[in-house]
């Protein structure tokens, strides 16, 4: 509450997160033209990345393009990309939607369709839908431990969200345990009124707000965090503005002296931890 | 504008960026003692990295040291590093400029020069100039989509820079389209009075400032972002303070039972998105 | 100092860091059942990661689990994990502490102990103590250059911590050189009253606070940074809240057509650069 006689100071904050959980992933894997059921286990080293700062990312879905190599090939026949003759293909042209540079030739993509030939990582990425349901949908049960150290330098006051009295096997609950800083990912979504299973398909951004409203006067001292949650990406976003949250990364390797890569389009939830508040003192 | 009767509150912000573009890179590649022209395509997975927070990085240039292995070799003969006898080399010494630990011996680096032998990743990195012009100079034509969600918790007000009415094929222009949040990298530099082609060689840091001056009173409501751009690194910086922006990273692999790495010194532009402003309400 | 007649504005800041140093690491390496002394050199590309924003990480210790492959194996026999019959193992169960999913069978881990069989990256990670002393304890002698560009947009004022008159071979010292922005990591710890050698074992988080108290009035202009240091992680933290600072990451590769990984549990110091302060002008 506003105490107008107090000198207010904004919070200086540092955050450290630790995600826990294992996901069991079942998907169709094609090898040597044969499609079979693949089963694998993902642990933290597989689905999250060493990150700094006030964000962490949990991969919930992916599309892989394996064994890509730099060469010439027909581009992917997405809407408006097909051709019937070389006239439709412009040498040196880079279509922002495409993944390569056109050679000027129109070549067969498959038995029925022709597209412009490109110099690219080939075969080019198929623009297929993210798997539904999401491959790592069980990430809903992962937990994250959030450690937050705060400082009001003008008041020379430091504290943290985890107190010595706290129990490391707790789980945050708005009513029953509002000071516990171990959060089940599914609960965060529920609190924000969102459906984890749905968001996991395309990815999204979730805000974890930590609000410190600190009264540092000795006679009425209070300084504990309040947690709240809200979705930060726009779920109603137009296709052209890239809804959800995904990024591409590559694993490079050599085979028969040829540089190859596996391209991974990773969909997932980026959690932004937004710490704010003030410390007031007479 | 300052309305003294209003209660002002600083903005809480979350940013999401998406870079698009392909670069065609032509460079001299030496293999088995033979130098030939190499031609390759770089897409987002090759020139940018999965990053969190209010920054994104676009690689515009690089120097590779391929096939390094942990062994003994002469250090690079940079200024002041040459020797004529073992007396000049001190066993166990780590020169901060060097990349290894001296064995105490002075050995031939090439036909004309001798340097101290070191235990290091060998052959040690050549301290050569960044290629000029920059290898990915065409990154000037890449575009970045910036999504910014802001929140004034005290006023319980949330908005974003992308509105449902916006068109996903726009490009930001200070006069013609100041609300479009898709930016051409070259335009950002032009707006900041900088030369992309020049900065791309050594790298640099560019600030994209998003200023929200929000009047949240219902009778004169206004809350839209204003974009401005300024270079954040010091282009006149002394050599000793490492001008530009670069970092080294490594790709590790095994060959002939020996752990090897390719060291990449990546030069590029780090874009920092600096969101600030206030929400005022009676 | 507080000048009540001034209009105060919070600082907008951008940070760029550059770590320098080499570490010599000696450890026991087991290959083909034979244990021998391993000796290697770590340079910046080995112990730090390309990071954005106001943080950088220096690896000071690690535990490796080499040649893991997705299969079935007994889980690690940590406290409470041993079994004597299949009844103790529940098919499909994922223990958050474990690294896999139980098959329902109780199998021998070694000659004396049995544990539940899991589907996981095998052999599962041994829960052994971080090496003591830390493998990269010599990181104490690494240095970091910190470049900080600040901006007060309302006052249209920009400056940086590195001035043209500064000397790139300086080292920060609270008394003798308080404006030098090259810091020895060991000195940062000493200033914060912490023991680098101790913290290096389990890792930790160290805050580097840069305080700008700027008087922008022309008649008494002053705007230089003040550096201070404090530990941000809780050294007295209960085991259940994961003391120190570590994360796991993996290097993936293929051998005999089988996907394998080396899992690295990296312990280290995350340095958070916390920039704050105000610019005041009449």
């Amino acid at each position: 509450s506003d105490k107008l006689y107090q000198r207010k100071e904004p919070v200086i904050s540092s955050v450290h997160t630790k995600v826990k959980g294992i996901a069991e992933v079942t998907e169709n894997v094609t090898e040597g033209g044969v499609t079979k059921l693949g089963h694998s286990i993902f642990d933290t080293a597989d689905y999250t990345f060493p990150l700094q700062g006030n964000s962490f990312f949990v991969m919930t879905n992916y599309v892989k393009s394996e064994g890509q190599v730099q060469t010439l090939c027909p581009e992917y026949p997405r809407r408006g990309a097909q051709c019937s003759s070389d006239r439709r293909c412009k040498k040196g042209w880079m279509d922002p939607q495409s993944k390569g540079i056109q050679t000027g030739r129109c070549v067969p993509y498959d038995k029925t369709r022709k597209t412009c030939e490109v110099s690219a990582w080939c075969p080019t990425e198929e623009e297929k839908e993210a798997p539904r349901p999401a491959l790592l949908r069980s990430a809903e049960n992962f937990t994250v431990l959030i450690k937050n150290n705060i400082h009001f330098p003008g008041h020379n006051y430091t504290t943290r969200n985890i107190l010595p009295t706290m129990n490391g096997s707790c789980t945050f609950h708005k009513t029953w345990d509002p000071q516990c800083s171990i959060f089940r990912l599914g609960d965060i979504f529920q609190e924000a009124g969102e459906n984890f299973t749905e968001v996991a398909v395309q990815g999204g951004i979730m805000g974890i707000e930590i609000y410190w409203d600190c009264n540092l006067d000795s006679w009425s001292h209070h300084c504990r965090p309040r947690y709240s949650f809200r979705r930060l990406d726009d779920k109603n976003m137009d296709e052209s503005f890239v809804p959800g949250y995904n990024f591409r990364y590559a694993k490079y390797y050599k085979e028969n002296n040829v540089e190859k890569r596996t391209l991974i389009k990773a969909f997932g939830i980026r959690f932004d931890i937004l710490v704010f508040g003030t410390g007031g003192k007479f | 504008s300052d309305k003294l009767y209003q209660r002002k509150e600083p903005v809480i912000s979350s940013v999401h960026t998406k870079v698009k573009g392909i670069a065609e890179v032509t460079e001299n590649v030496t293999e088995g003692g033979v130098t030939k022209l190499g031609h390759s395509i770089f897409d987002t997975a090759d020139y940018t990295f999965p990053l969190q927070g209010n920054s994104f990085f676009v690689m515009t240039n690089y120097v590779k040291s391929e096939g390094q292995v942990q062994t003994l070799c002469p250090e690079y003969p940079r200024r002041g590093a040459q020797c004529s006898s073992d007396r000049r080399c001190k066993k166990g010494w780590m020169d901060p400029q060097s990349k290894g630990i001296q064995t105490g011996r002075c050995v031939p680096y090439d036909k004309t020069r001798k340097t101290c032998e070191v235990s290091a990743w060998c052959p040690t990195e050549e301290e050569k100039e960044a290629p000029r012009p920059a290898l990915l100079r065409s990154a000037e034509n890449f575009t970045v989509l910036i999504k910014n969600n802001i929140h004034f918790p005290g006023h319980n007000y949330t908005t974003r820079n992308i509105l449902p009415t916006m068109n996903g094929s726009c490009t930001f222009h200070k006069t013609w389209d100041p609300q479009c949040s898709i930016f051409r990298l070259g335009d950002i530099f032009q707006e900041a009075g900088e030369n992309f082609t020049e900065v791309a060689v050594q790298g640099g840091i560019m600030g994209i400032e998003i200023y929200w001056d929000c009047n949240l009173d219902s009778w004169s409501h206004h809350c839209r972002p204003r974009y401005s751009f300024r270079r954040l690194d010091d282009k006149n910086m002394d050599e000793s303070f490492v001008p530009g922006y670069n970092f080294r990273y490594a790709k590790y692999y095994k060959e002939n039972n020996v752990e090897k790495r390719t060291l990449i010194k990546a030069f590029g532009i780090r874009f920092d998105i600096l969101v600030f402003g206030t929400g005022g309400k009676f | 100092s507080d000048k009540l007649y001034q209009r105060k504005e919070p600082v907008i800041s951008s940070v760029h860091t550059k770590v320098k140093g080499i570490a010599e690491v000696t450890e026991n390496v087991t290959e083909g059942g034979v244990t021998k002394l391993g000796h290697s050199i770590f340079d910046t590309a080995d112990y730090t990661f390309p990071l954005q924003g106001n943080s950088f990480f220096v690896m000071t210790n690690y535990v490796k689990s080499e040649g893991q492959v997705q299969t079935l194996c007994p889980e690690y026999p940590r406290r409470g994990a041993q079994c004597s019959s299949d009844r103790r193992c529940k098919k499909g169960w994922m223990d958050p502490q474990s690294k896999g999913i139980q098959t329902g069978r109780c199998v021998p881990y070694d000659k004396t102990r049995k544990t539940c069989e899991v589907s996981a990256w095998c052999p599962t990670e041994e829960e052994k103590e971080a090496p003591r002393p830390a493998l990269l304890r010599s990181a104490e002698n690494f240095t970091v250059l910190i470049k900080n560009n600040i901006h007060f947009p309302g006052h249209n004022y920009t400056t940086r911590n590195i001035l043209p008159t500064m000397n790139g071979s300086c080292t920060f010292h609270k008394t003798w050189d308080p404006q030098c922005s090259i810091f020895r990591l060991g000195d940062i710890f000493q200033e914060a009253g912490e023991n680098f050698t101790e913290v290096a074992v389990q890792g930790g988080i160290m805050g580097i606070e840069i305080y700008w108290d700027c008087n922008l009035d022309s008649w008494s202009h002053h705007c230089r940074p003040r550096y201070s240091f404090r530990r941000l992680d809780d050294k007295n933290m209960d085991e259940s809240f994961v003391p120190g600072y570590n994360f796991r990451y993996a290097k993936y590769y293929k051998e005999n057509n089988v996907e394998k990984r080396t899992l690295i549990k990296a312990f280290g110091i995350r340095f958070d650069i916390l920039v704050f302060g105000t610019g005041g002008k009449f």
């Epitope: - | 096939g67 292995v69 062994t71 003994l72 064995t103 235990s119 052959p123 020996v258 090897k260 | -």
Partner: nanobody, 120 residues
């Protein structure tokens, strides 16, 4: 005691081939550069070819394209495959290795020479 144990060598006709091998044995930390040198009667010892631990090779102009140096890092062995031999290749061939007994304790080791004679 570290030793370099060689094998190969002998008499061969011009245009023929020979393969030399040389293995480092004993107790040591790491084998770094390995090389083959040769010394013809009345001449100075000269470098034939060398190979780094990372398999980078370097050849004397006189043998380039005819000789191939390689190594096996598991067996700590260096090989010299000599094709298209000429009478002027006749010499005593010496194996060389730069071996670290312990970290940062390097020593140069030479093998006993092996005679290669190429008859015309």
């Amino acid at each position: 005691e570290v030793q370099l144990v060689k094998s190969g060598g002998g008499l061969v006709q011009a245009g023929g081939s020979l393969r030399l091998s040389c293995a480092a044995s004993g107790s040591f930390f790491r084998v770094n550069n390995m090389a083959w040198y040769r010394q013809a009667p009345g001449k100075q010892r000269e470098l034939v070819a060398d190979i780094t631990r990372g398999d980078r090779t370097n050849y004397a102009d006189s043998v380039n394209g005819r000789f191939t140096i390689s190594r096996d890092n598991v067996r700590n062995t260096v090989y010299l495959q000599m094709n298209g031999l000429k009478p002027e290749d006749t010499a005593v061939y010496y194996c060389y290795a730069r071996i670290e007994l312990g970290p940062l304790v390097p020593r140069d080791y030479w093998g006993q020479g092996t005679q290669v004679t190429v008859s015309s």
